[in-house]
């Protein structure tokens, strides 16, 4: 058993049918010695008396808010949560496996640049009685500071019969140098509590591996005289690291017909302009990627050919 | 990534082309190592990230873009004198560069070159003959060092009398390649920045 926060405790259980469970001793936080009784949740049934209460925690029915009283007055509370270990592996019931970029990916994180700011998100089908708390650091043995905000519900989607909820959090490394070469990964730890179930999820990454630039901005077309060709131009996104001559991007320019089946013409360039043939009803899209370290491509920025 | 490669103009900052070749070569070598050594811990998540140049060179600090010198977090041990030799910089660009930058890059390359050559000698003794260092990568390191044209005493190749542990050597190869790829990215950024200056 360990303390998650004041008066909230996590009991770790080897989870299998007929398991013996864990013996837990609760102590009433009071100078009183006599006349103390214990109850669980809203029940008025007295579970025991005395300054300490010994319980065998086996299942969720044994978890909850234990309260010690004296003469009708509440003295203190202890909330017991359960953390299930199923055959040596901690349970992952609360969050959905996003399966991207690989199986057992519960937390996904992205950064728009090298400033040390990043966003993580996760999915669940649970709508109520759910709380999250997020901590992060650079490295784990001698951790350096990363400050995270509160996790917020960022999207709701309908997936078949189920509703899916996306939560996200923004974090910022306290003293980040955009040009630094990372040797210790960022660690992100999410505590999830659903009713009386506790779970924790972690992700470990280098900022350089989660970079996804914003799409190029100010995408414009300039027709070339007496030609079907157009000059496409664009700019670096505002959120990208500066100076751009140091943090350079490379670009992919795509001409896509109205139908998805039509052949796509693609050109790669390090410049912020390109000359392409604009077909009728086609659209021109441009996306960006770090020129020197191949992390994710940005989403496409698009303009119609006409 | 298989992108069309632009040929640099003759007037272009001469080291840029070499640094681009270096990044391409080390990235290819790392990819090859990860595929060949699939049963070894060779992915970024599995290896210890060690920097053999740590406390010996200061490339990131010495080559920091001027715009980032205002960032407190970037100023660990920054040297501020300006470059006075090295053939990569035309004289009119000299003032844009700090003294230690190119020599620090040169020292990095020299240290990695020695490590890679020592390691290759060990890998050649492996009866499995599983993996060797790409000669192209070693040649590209050499070309960039020559383009940097710094005079420094040659570091003797380390020779080891004890029987090599091939498992450990292959893991060390992965560690070295990951670190060298990161340094090659920094070198490319620096060369690109200098070219634009």
């Amino acid at each position: 058993i360990w303390e998650l926060k004041k008066d909230v405790y996590v009991v770790e259980l080897d989870w299998y049918p007929d398991a013996p469970g864990e013996m837990v001793v609760l102590t009433c936080d009071t100078p009183e010695e006599d006349g103390i009784t214990w109850t669980l949740d809203q029940s008025s049934e007295v579970l025991g008396s005395g300054k300490t209460l010994t319980i065998q925690v086996k299942e969720f029915g044994d978890a909850g808010q234990y309260t010690c009283h004296k003469g009708g007055e509440v003295l203190s509370h202890s909330l017991l949560l359960l953390h299930k270990k199923e055959d040596g592996i901690w349970s992952t019931d609360i969050l959905k496996d996003q399966k991207e970029p690989k199986n057992k990916t519960f937390l996904r994180c992205e950064a728009k640049n090298y400033s040390g700011r990043f966003t993580c998100w996760w999915l669940t089908t649970i709508s109520t009685d759910l709380t999250f708390s997020v901590k992060s650091s650079r490295g784990s043995s001698d951790p350096q500071g990363v400050t995270c905000g509160a996790a917020t519900l960022s999207a709701e989607r309908v997936r078949g019969d189920n509703k899916e909820y996306e939560y996200s959090v923004e974090c910022q490394e306290d003293s980040a140098c955009p040009a630094a070469e990372e040797s210790l990964p960022i660690e992100v730890m999410v505590d999830a509590v659903h009713k009386l179930k506790y779970e924790n999820y972690t992700s470990s990454f280098f900022i350089r591996d989660i970079i996804k630039p914003d799409p190029p901005k100010n995408l414009q077309l300039k027709p070339l005289k007496n030609s079907r060709q157009v000059e496409v131009s664009w700019e670096y996104p505002d959120t990208w690291s500066t100076p751009h001559s140091y943090f350079s991007l490379t670009f992919c320019v795509q001409v896509q017909g109205k139908s998805k089946r039509e052949k796509k013409d693609r050109v790669f360039t390090d410049k912020t302009s390109a000359t392409v043939i604009c077909r009728k009803n086609a659209s021109i899209s441009v996306r960006a990627q770090d020129r020197y370290y191949s992390s994710s491509w940005s989403e496409w920025a698009s303009v119609p050919c006409s | 990534r298989n992108l069309p490669v632009a040929t640099p103009d003759p007037g272009m900052f001469p080291c840029l082309h070499h640094s681009q070749n270096l990044l391409r070569a080390v990235s290819n070598m790392l990819q090859k190592a990860r595929q060949t050594l699939e049963f070894y811990p060779c992915t970024s998540e599995e290896i210890d990230h060690e920097d053999i140049t740590k406390d010996k060179t200061s490339t990131v600090e010495a080559c920091l873009p001027l715009e980032l010198t205002k960032n407190e977090s970037c100023l660990n041990s920054r040297e501020t004198s300006f470059i006075t030799n090295g053939s990569c910089l035309a004289s009119r660009k000299t003032s844009f560069m700090m003294a230690l930058c190119l020599s620090s890059i040169y020292e990095d390359l020299k240290m990695y070159q020695v490590e890679f050559k020592t390691m290759n000698a060990k890998l050649l003794m492996d009866p499995k003959r599983q993996i060797f260092l790409d000669q192209n990568m070693l040649a590209v390191i050499d070309e960039l060092m020559q383009a940097l044209n710094f005079n420094s005493e040659t570091v003797p190749q380390k020779s080891s009398l004890e029987e090599p542990d091939f498992y450990k050597t292959k893991i060390k190869l992965c560690i070295l390649l990951h670190a060298f790829r990161i340094r090659a990215v920094t070198i490319d950024r620096v060369m690109s920045y200098l070219n634009a200056s």
Epitope: W15, P17, I89, T125 | -
Partner: antibody, heavy 115, light 112 residues
Framework: QVQLVQSGGGVVQPGRSLRLSCAAS????????MHWVRQAPGKGLEWVAF????????YYADSVKGRFTISRDNSKNTLYLQMKSLRAEDTAVYYC????????WGQGTMVTVSS | SYVLTQPPSVSGTPGQRVTISCSGG????????VKWYQQLPGTAPKLLIY???QRPSGVPDRFSGSKSGTSASLAITGVQAEDEADYYC????????????FGTGTKVTVLG
């Protein structure tokens, strides 16, 4: 004590269907994940499928994906394996089993796919 | 498509020490715990070892398990006639959990 009693096995022609049941008692069935494991005659153990305690997630071996469906009825304390488009290579003893460090197995039920 | 490899058979005379190996990889045994089962003819498998080296109550102490890196082993110290059976190791793969990964199985024969 924990008990898993299996039923539903038998002889079936290729391409036909069969449903296996596993009745649980002696524990809170709705709190635990459950597996199906099979063993072809003279061969080793092969995992078939898993279902979470609440039925929310199901996992299958590639060899049965799209043909077999694992399900549970927590109100009846019963686990099921619906087998469709049966093939000769599905001939095996099928076991249900609890998930956890200490597990409990059903007695096994023989499924023979033969024309 | 077994990923955990065991020797097909091992044998010993009563009283001898018999060991069975189970060889896997970084993503399975290297990252997860190992179980060992005993299966007597015509019966369901019986758990002998869980969490690499833990014995459930009721399992004789002549059975012991260990794990090192990407392989595990089961030892029967002082093998007895009633130990003649098939033995299977089991683990998980970190990418496909909760799918059970079973070993190829080992037939233990007690001679004499």
């Amino acid at each position: 004590q924990v008990q898993l009693v299996q039923s539903g096995g038998g002889v079936v022609q290729p391409g036909r269907s069969l449903r296996l049941s596993c009745a649980a008692s002696g524990f809170t069935f709705s709190s635990y994940g459950m597996h199906w494991v099979r063993q072809a005659p003279g061969k080793g153990l092969e995992w078939v499928a898993f279902i979470r305690y609440d039925g929310s997630n199901k996992y299958y071996a590639d060899s049965v994906k799209g043909r077999f469906t694992i399900s549970r009825d927590n109100s009846k304390n019963t686990l099921y394996l619906q087998m469709k488009s049966l093939r000769a290579e599905d001939t095996a003893v099928y076991y249900c089993k609890t998930h956890g460090s200490h597990d409990n197995w059903g007695q096994g039920t023989m499924v023979t796919v033969s024309s | 498509s077994y990923v955990l490899t065991q020797p097909p058979s091992v044998s010993g005379t009563p009283g001898q020490r018999v060991t069975i190996s189970c060889s896997g990889g970084r993503s399975n045994i290297g990252s997860n715990t190992v179980k060992w089962y005993q299966q007597l003819p015509g019966t369901a498998p019986k758990l002998l070892i869980y969490h690499n080296d833990q014995r459930p109550s009721g399992v004789p102490d002549r059975f012991s398990g260990s794990k090192s890196g990407t392989s595990a082993s089961l030892a029967i110290t002082g093998v007895q006639a009633e130990d003649e059976a098939d033995y299977y190791c089991q683990s998980y793969d970190r990418g496909t959990h909760p799918a059970l990964l079973f070993g190829t199985g080992t037939k233990v024969t007690v001679l004499g």
